[in-house]
Amino acid sequence: EKLPKAPVITTPLETVDALVEEVATFMCAVESYPQPEISWTRNKILIKLFDTRYSIRENGQLLTILSVEDSDDGIYCCTANNGVGGAVESCGALQVKMKPKITRPPINVKIIEGLKAVLPCTTMGNPKPSVSWIKGDSALRENSRIAVLESGSLRIHNVQKEDAGQYRCVAKNSLGTAYSKLVKLEVEVFARILRAPESHNVTFGSFVTLRCTAIGMPVPTISWIENGNAVSSGSIQENVKDRVIDSRLQLFITKPGLYTCIATNKHGEKFSTAKAAATVSIAEWSKSQKESKGYCAQYRGEVCDAVLVKDSLVFFNTSYPDPEEAQELLIHTAWNELKAVSPLCRPAAEALLCNHLFQECSPGVLPTPMPICREYCLAVKELFCAKEWLAMEGKTHRGLYRSGMHFLPVPECSKLPSMHQDPTACTRLPYLDYKKENITTFPSITSSKPSVDIPNLPASTSSFAVSPAYSMT
């Protein structure tokens, strides 16, 4: 009869590499008498005999994982015990190897030029796959703008037109390679005018062609505006080639005008617009009807800083040697004159003077100042500053004040354009944009009632806080 023999593991467990969905087997050969009981653990947790994911054969000496999963990674141990001597154990690791798999592939992207684009490419695999990108037919090279992130995603800073194209990501490890589907990166470009229309000085009855060329992605549409309104007459020809639109407006000239080319394209729900303007003037047009010469620029003075619309362009009159300084000096002097007027009148008068002296400006080849709307001028004259206006008119006939060198006329309200005729042709005074009900007392004026309706606009303030603290020294 055989003598009892304690168990000995003759083939210790080794590390097993296995691919996902493949079979993995651990062999634990044991010599002993009587026959041992063999149990198996994974990460110190007992594998149950009836677990259908495993097959245990050869009296427990053979453990087979029937279809390896990612989560099967770990340390497997077999323990043999037959009651003779102590139990013996051997352990080995299962390393689940996995061909690259793209779990979050890139998708088609539309992006506006200059923004940041991120194309995702999240991968799985063991060993961890390296991710590279292909644009068109060739490998994409990283640079200061283009980087493959740790996650595998492709990040492009400050997207340029030339970044548009077809992309795919490639995940690679020692077991294989996975490719994503091709995706499209479309770069949308804000509408931009390449060639602005040129100004013309022509004789009455001439034909003139204004040309405007714009680029963008998608290709922009071009519309034409004449003195602030849609062009009423004239023929338009358009030609589109390689994202560039060329529009030509042919006009029969019977009056001078400011013609604006507006290029627009759409990016999702938003639109981008570019504008360029040209003037058509008529030779020998009477001098009195010509615009004064000047230029449009940002107001950077002090006196009217809180009164003028922030960051708007204002008109500087080049009949002064130094327009910016001369106009600032005029308003500085006028402001001092206003110290004596009533609290009701002062802010309204300040708004009127600042917007009259620094008129809002439409840039172009011939910059055009935009006068104050007649209704606002009358509101100041006949409502807010009725007494003061009469007194000042008596003193200086046409103007608020005279200084040694300059004469600053108060605008003649009746000669100003009405906002009811063309709201875009004149400037509103923000100080007066409030409901007329907010006035509780009516200035006494010579006529029985004022000849003006204050524009009934949304309430912005119920009182006139005196605008900027400005110490005159």
Epitope: Q298, R300, E302, D311, E324, E325, E328, H332, Y470, S471
Partner: antibody, heavy 121, light 112 residues
Framework: EVQLLESGGGLVQPGGSLRLSCAAS????????MSWVRQAPGKGLEWVSA????????YYKESVKGRFTISRDNSKNTLYLQMNSLRAEDTAVYYC??????????????WGQGTLVTVSS | QTVVTQEPSFSVSPGGTVTLTCGLS?????????PDWYQQTPGQAPRTLIY???SRHSGVPDRFSGSILGNKAALTITGAQADDESDYYC????????????FGGGTKLTVL
């Protein structure tokens, strides 16, 4: 002839204070905006602060806001820059400059010779 | 934060013409930035050449002219002379949010 003469520079420890002065002559001081401009050793020009002729407003570079104060005394034809909580990066030659007109941001059309401020422990 | 950009260095032959430019890291330079140009020789205070885009400061030779070219301000020196070798800075009025004035990094002009 327009003349601008800075003074008040010197060596100061980090966190310390200095007051620069600029004495102006040769023009009607109150009619012109003034500015301070600095230049760190071997570096370019950097606008620091501006004030209009009236002294009614003041403007500062973001990094000096709350630490520097520009002021002027039109009766003394003098421009000042009070510098508090000084840092090593404030080390520079500080120029006083006259603007071309009464506003704070006209062109800088006349410059002083500068005064050196060194912030070091 | 918007940065004012200039070419770090430029060279020109005596008698030649050179155009130095001044741009913005985002956006275009316009007349509303009132571009000014300054010249500085080592150890000296700066000297104003051009103000408000194209106005020449008194005493500045008409070899120096200012303009806006495309989306940048430009300083053109025609008939360059040896003593034009200097650092040139542009200054721009900036007005988004709060008013300030920003200099470019400067261009070192060498007259070879």
């Amino acid at each position: 002839e327009v003349q601008l003469l800075e003074s008040g520079g010197g060596l100061v420890q980090p966190g310390g204070s200095l007051r620069l002065s600029c004495a102006a002559s040769g023009f009607t001081f109150s009619d012109y905006g003034m500015s301070w401009v600095r230049q760190a050793p071997g570096k370019g020009l950097e606008w620091v602060s501006a004030i209009p002729g009236s002294g009614g407003s003041t403007y500062y570079k973001e990094s000096v806001k709350g630490r520097f104060t520009i002021s002027r005394d039109n009766s003394k034809n003098t421009l000042y820059l009070q510098m508090n909580s000084l840092r090593a990066e404030d080390t520079a030659v500080y120029y006083c400059a006259k603007r071309s007109g009464r506003i704070a941001f006209g062109a800088l059309d006349a410059w002083g010779q500068g005064t050196l401020v060194t912030v070091s422990s | 934060q918007t940065v004012v950009t200039q070419e770090p260095s430029f060279s020109v032959s005596p008698g030649g013409t050179v155009t130095l430019t001044c741009g913005l890291s985002s956006g275009s330079v316009t007349s509303s930035n009132y571009p000014d140009w300054y010249q500085q020789t080592p150890g000296q205070a700066p000297r104003t050449l051009i103000y408000s885009t194209d106005s020449r400061h008194s005493g500045v030779p008409d070899r120096f002219s200012g303009s806006i070219l495309g989306n940048k301000a430009a300083l053109t020196i025609t008939g360059a002379q040896a003593d034009d070798e200097s650092d040139y800075y542009c200054g721009l009025y900036m007005y988004s949010g709060s008013k300030n004035y920003v200099f470019g990094g400067g261009t070192k002009l060498t007259v070879l």
